[in-house]
């Protein structure tokens, strides 16, 4: 029996009865917040073999092992994850072992086992046999291994029953509990699962099977389940669903889930029954079950009940996230804000069409309107008094409307009005008239030539770069010395630079009048020698990274025909040289036979160039005789924590303690102080723990149902 769409068992342990007939949980399983310690021995769910999403256990008092509850849980598919995890065991006060001795596969996601004060048998499980990558597993804050004394079956009697594998250079027995080994299939099966008798399953089986080489005898399917058979792909007229089974069109058409209730129903796309069309696709008609590609960004129509939407903060802009067509009028009134330009772009950057008018007034925080980076049409179906559909009034720092070289904007109906924008050059407004098709609509007073641009360098000369030199982390550039009509008016230069993976940046990107700026700025004084060209060495740059650079001349306010002259360069794109890559990450090695090692790693976080190959070096090491000195299988030899009469913990040590050697002196001394990198790593770790805990609490603490 398939149970779904996710089972949440909380407060009352008797709710576990809901799992009685489940063989597959299509969705997640939460068992949490059972504060009264109960006897779980009478609860056993041997039918449950698969959870398609994730398993979360949190604060369940009295539960000592999961093995009795779920003796046959074989696969957790991780189709949807809980904060990147498919198995979360958090603050389980009485859990002594995980005990899921039939768990063979976690298809996607990692595991997080944290703050379980009594939990042992963690180091005896080889998670690499269950998960593809163990590097993202997070196992901290549980019972210290030294206090556990984990013994696999038979080791006390010196008749070990479990198989051995290597984890972190430690070759050891693998088990779930004191009487349950971790199952491993014969190497002859390769990646295939196997039966209890070590016979290889059919390739389409996952985890285990009841009979060898039979696609109807699988405990779980590697790919998809349909009509009792594990299949590599869904048969004709059936569709993939929830990542594990095949369903027909009728089933898909009739799904009404709590998650999808507001949508128009599930769709069939690319052979899958899914909640919504994927990114880049839209329904082929409002009630259609099929998707077609969008031309450009997928349309999302947003409507304002009160006709006019006032954007006076990031919060109000947030309501427009994803909107491509705005039915109504936009009134932008941004007086202040932090990182406002990029926040507005994030939330309003997809708007293509405004059906009414756009009014920008008293927006002293804005330097540019480029945050409306996809606006291409203002219909002007509703206009302001005076028939204005684009109205720009009293914006003290507005310098740019849009980058007209890369912008097509049409104003279908209505006029434009500009007044009291002291840093907005009239030439910029005239350019907008041409691009938008409004030239000739405006009357004389609609674009005020005296109070627009009165405090801006509107007549700009072009500065030309003369040379560029690069190394792995430096750029040296020089440019022509600018000579204004009166040389005393030139004060200095400002160089602006930033990382630019693509050649599409503009001067006003991410810039606002409140101090946020995506550009780094460096002031460059005039060289005292008039014949030397000004230049700068930019250092501390990243290797193999493209930067955008431009230079502005800083001039005195020099009025000429009521306007200020200035000079700036075009934007120059320049890439630093390649360098040595950082070290490869997460290097893991394991032996799969007596003569082979398998080594895996992830690419370096900083390739610093185009990676072409890796070099793997190895050397034979002498066997460590220390491993043979003690019989670790006998209980009394395991170091047991004792408590001294004083306040210090003493651990029994079976050989001389190793002393730290600091600096050049050979002798015992205190541990070296932590490096900045270590301190930073610890800080990030603590932060990550907090973020996860907040996510957990926010996800599971919900108002009590009626």
């Amino acid at each position: 029996e398939i149970c779904g769409p996710g089972i949440d068992i909380r407060n009352d342990y008797q709710q576990l009865k809901r799992l009685e007939n489940c063989t597959v949980i299509e969705g997640y399983l939460h068992i949490l917040l059972i504060s009264k310690a109960e006897d779980y021995r009478s609860y056993r769910f041997p039918k449950l073999t698969v959870i398609t999403e994730y398993l979360l256990l949190f604060r369940v008092a009295g539960l000592e092992s999961l093995g009795d509850l779920f003796p046959n849980l074989t696969v957790i598919r991780g189709w949807k994850l809980f904060y990147n995890y498919a198995l979360v065991i958090f603050e389980m006060t009485n859990l002594k072992d995980i005990g899921l001795y039939n768990l063979r596969n976690i298809t996607r996601g990692a595991i997080r086992i944290e703050k379980n004060a009594d939990l042992c048998y963690l180091s005896t499980v080889d998670w690499s046999l269950i998960l593809d990558a163990v590097s993202n597993n997070y196992i901290v804050g549980n019972k210290p291994p030294k206090e556990c004394g984990d013994l696999c079956p038979g080791t006390m009697e010196e008749k070990p029953m479990c198989e051995k594998t290597t984890i972190n250079n430690e070759y050891n027995y693998r088990c779930w509990t004191t009487n349950r080994c971790q199952k491993m299939c014969p190497s002859t099966c390769g990646k295939r699962a196997c039966t209890e008798n070590n016979e290889c399953c059919h390739p389409e089986c996952l985890g285990s099977c009841s009979a060898p080489d039979n696609d109807t005898a699988c405990v779980a399917c590697r790919h998809y389940y349909y009509a009792g058979v594990c299949v590599p792909a869904c048969p004709p007229n059936t569709y993939r669903f929830e990542g594990w089974r095949c369903v027909d069109r009728d089933f898909c058409a009739n799904i009404l889930s709590a998650e999808s209730s507001d949508s128009e129903g599930f769709v069939i796309h690319d052979g899958e029954c899914m909640q919504e069309c994927p990114s880049g696709f839209i329904r082929n008609g409002s009630q259609s079950m099929y998707c077609i590609p969008c031309e450009g960004p997928c349309p999302k129509v947003c409507e304002e009940e009160k006709k006019t939407k006032t954007i006076d903060s990031v919060t109000s802009a947030q309501m427009l996230q994803g909107c491509t067509i705005f039915k109504g009028n936009l009134l932008i009134n941004i007086r202040r804000g932090n990182n406002i330009a990029s926040e507005l772009e994030n939330f309003m950057g997809l708007i293509e069409v405004v059906t009414g008018y756009v009014k920008i007034r008293h927006s002293h925080a804005l330097v540019s309107l480029s945050f409306l980076k996809n606006l291409r049409l203002i219909l002007g179906e509703e206009q302001l008094e005076g028939n204005y559909s684009f109205y720009v009034l009293d914006n003290q720092n507005l310098q740019q409307l849009w980058d007209w070289d890369h912008r097509n904007l049409t104003i279908k109906a209505g006029k434009m009005y500009f007044a009291f924008n002291p840093k907005l050059c009239v030439s910029e407004i005239y350019r907008m008239e041409e691009v938008t098709g409004t030239k000739g609509r405006q009357s004389k007073g609609d674009i005020n030539t005296r109070n627009n641009g009165e405090r801006a360098s509107c007549e700009s000369d072009v500065l030309h770069f003369t040379s560029t030199t690069t190394s792995k982390n430096r750029i040296i550039i020089t440019w022509h010395r600018y000579r204004p009509p009166d040389y005393r008016d030139l004060i200095s230069f400002t160089v602006y630079y930033k990382e630019a993976p693509f050649k599409n940046v503009t001067e006003y990107d991410g810039q606002d009048a409140c101090g946020s700026n995506s550009w780094n700025m460096v002031d460059v004084d005039l060289p005292p020698n008039k014949d030397v060209e000004p230049g700068i060495l930019l250092h501390g740059l990243k290797p193999w990274t493209q930067y955008a650079v431009y230079v502005k001349a800083v001039t005195l306010t020099m009025v000429e025909n009521d306007h200020i002259r200035g000079a700036k360069s075009e934007i120059l794109y320049i890439r630093t040289n390649a360098s040595v890559p950082s070290i490869p990450l997460d290097v893991l090695s394991a032996s799969n036979s007596s003569s082979q090692l398998i080594v895996k790693w992830n690419p370096p976080s900083l390739p610093n160039g185009n990676l072409s190959y890796y070099i793997v070096r190895w050397q034979r090491q002498p066997q460590d005789g220390y491993l043979y000195r003690h019989n670790y299988c006998s209980k009394d030899k395991i170091p047991i924590r004792k408590y001294a009469d004083g306040t210090i913990d003493i651990e029994e040590v079976t050989e001389n303690p190793k002393t730290e050697v600091c600096g050049g002196e050979k002798g015992p001394c205190c541990a070296c102080p932590k490096t900045e990198a270590e301190k930073q790593a610890e800080k990030e770790e603590a932060e990550y723990r907090k973020v996860f805990e907040n996510f957990l609490h926010n996800s599971i603490f919900v108002p009590r149902p009626e």
Epitope: G4, A253, N254, A258, S261, P705
Partner: antibody
Amino acid sequence: QVQLQESGPGLVKPSETLSLTCTVSGYSITGGYLWNWIRQPPGKGLEWMGYISYDGTNNYKPSLKDRITISRDTSKNQFSLKLSSVTAADTAVYYCARYGRVFFDYWGQGTLVTVSS
Amino acid sequence: DIVMTQSPLSLPVTPGEPASISCRSSQSIVHSNGNTYLQWYLQKPGQSPQLLIYKVSNRLYGVPDRFSGSGSGTDFTLKISRVEAEDVGVYYCFQGSHVPWTFGQGTKVEIK
């Protein structure tokens, strides 16, 4: 895989309240769908009575509105029908059924309730 | 309430012959979203109803292709191209477009 099972007394006295419970297995009633009660008087046609949705909202047939209550117990994954002031005209086979976006896809096997003194 | 009227109420048929059941609604059952939520159910003796057709003409996966549905607005028809013995039972049309949802009074199909 989804199963619905009606339960409750087979005999109710006139003017009393008829109470039935539908136990759902294989799907959480809070996870989605509309959970309905439908009845069929002996030898007659089907009559839709009302539903409770996955989020707990109700919809009832107007002619029954004053007498009907459909509620749920999410911890037991059950939903219930209460019909007050019953008369002989309420004698019927009562079905619980699940309705999705388009149709009824799962039905209980039905339970006969007789109203008689 | 929307009244669903079926005809005939009784339909004796010969195996292998075609059969047709009509269902009329007292007003249009086109939903505001453009869909028409009209279904046909078959109730065999002693069983719960089972779905045959949804949204006027969509045959449920696994239902024999001798069953077909058609119609629009207020007039709908269920056709069986060649009746078989297993098709006996009471056929109900049902509208789920407007609350309260309503069933037709049923058409009893029996073998002559």
